[in-house]
């Protein structure tokens, strides 16, 4: 399986909400001994590998923001802890999973990573990640709403987020 990032860049005004999205692609083993662990974290474009370093998002670690379930089941993070920080991560039945960040500030700008771990008990873990950039802007040059830019593999036109 693979992880797709529909958008590689999100440009948002300060105070806006944004939902960063990843999508699980390809065949998903729904066997009894296969489970999926999904999470989000901030990172940097490291020299060795992008998304290797795991930094907190608004003081919440990737352990706090994880989703756990089998296959394409829906799931949510622990609501209380995340929502106190203006965050919520969620997953649906179609392989989409996302993190919503409310009331953006300039400090939220940076590289965000989604991580999916396919756990084949008795065999191994298979991990894949996706990366996307969030730019929070302020002042007269800031857009009125979030503007998202598709990843290079998709259409190059920018799409305004709903």
């Amino acid at each position: 399986f693979k992880v797709a990032t529909p958008y590689s860049l999100y440009v948002c005004p300060e105070g806006q909400n944004v939902t960063l999205t990843c999508r699980l692609l390809g065949p998903v083993d729904k066997g009894h001994d296969v489970t999926f662990y999904k999470t989000w974290y901030r990172s940097s474009r490291g020299e060795v590998q992008t998304c290797s370093e795991r930094r907190p998002i608004r003081n919440l670690t990737f352990q706090d923001l994880h989703l756990h379930h089998g296959g394409h089941q829906a799931a949510n993070t622990s609501h209380d802890l995340a929502q106190r920080h203006g965050l919520e991560s969620a997953s649906d039945h179609h392989g989409n999973f996302s993190i919503t960040m409310r009331n953006l500030t300039l400090l939220d700008s940076g590289l965000y990573c989604c991580l999916v771990v396919e756990i084949r008990h008795h065999h191994s873990e298979h991990r894949v990640h996706g990366a996307m950039e969030l730019q929070v802007q302020t002042g007269k040059d800031a857009p009125s709403n979030c503007v998202v830019y598709p990843s290079s593999s998709q259409d190059s036109e920018n799409i305004t987020a709903a």
């Epitope: 009894h32 662990y37 060795v48 352990q63 756990h68 771990v117 756990i119 008990h121 065999h123 191994s124």
Partner: antibody
């Protein structure tokens, strides 16, 4: 802050079953791997096995089928049973939280188990 | 199973010196390798994950490097509290395995 605490008898007779429990406090047991690791006196670390929150288990083939790991989410506890013990099973036994695609990030303080008649 | 071989078994150094510890895997573990520190009578503590990333709260004097089969943990300038045993651990597949450890002792 998640904390782990091992409990169980410190002395077990050869051929009997070693039973230990790990109590998880300060966080949920309903996620992650919950693992057992041991360390014979003066030696290195050996991974025994884990139970995943979903109930799936996995253990070190070197221990053959002597290992049983179970979880009681209502008590926030997981347990280890190691059958047919010998003196070679004498060790400090640790419980630990293991994060998928990460590492053992939280450990109990360990409990010494001696196998002797 | 994957065998991890650590060297040297013992490293005798003075505070302020640089420590270089090696871990070699019997087959490639990519960068899925962690390092732990263990002091007498205590549980191990996570230092490094994914070969080169410091865990939360770990001082910058600890650094990891390597990928594939050869890995290094470096302590740039030893502090008195750094004298301990260090273990590497792979997680590319099960069973999870640890190296035999390197003891860093005061010279």
């Amino acid at each position: 802050q998640v904390q782990l605490q091992e409990s169980g008898p410190g002395l077990v007779k050869p051929s009997e079953t070693l039973s230990l429990t790990c109590t998880v406090s300060g966080g949920s047991i309903s996620s992650y791997y919950w693992s057992w690791i041991r360390q014979p006196p003066g030696k290195g670390l050996e991974w025994i096995g884990y139970i995943y929150y979903s109930g799936s288990t996995n253990h070190n083939p070197s221990l053959k089928s002597r290992v049983t790991i179970s979880v009681d989410t209502s008590k926030s506890q997981f347990s280890l049973k190691l059958s047919s013990v010998t003196a070679a099973d004498t060790a400090v036994y640790y419980c630990a939280r293991d994060i998928p695609a990460f590492a053992f990030d939280i450990w109990g303080q360990g409990t010494m188990v001696i196998v002797s008649s | 199973e994957i065998v991890l071989t650590q060297s040297p078994a013992t490293l005798s150094l003075s505070p302020g010196e640089r420590a270089t510890l090696s871990c070699r895997a019997s087959q490639s573990v990519s960068y899925y390798l962690a390092w732990y520190q263990q002091k007498p009578g205590q549980a191990p503590r996570l230092l490094i994950y994914d070969a080169f990333n410091r865990a939360t709260g770990i001082p910058a004097r600890f650094s990891g490097s390597g990928s594939g089969t050869d890995f290094t943990l470096t302590i740039s300038s030893l502090e008195p509290e750094d004298f301990a045993v260090y273990y590497c651990q792979q997680r590319i597949n099960w069973p999870l395995t640890f190296g035999g450890g390197t003891k860093v002792e005061i010279k």
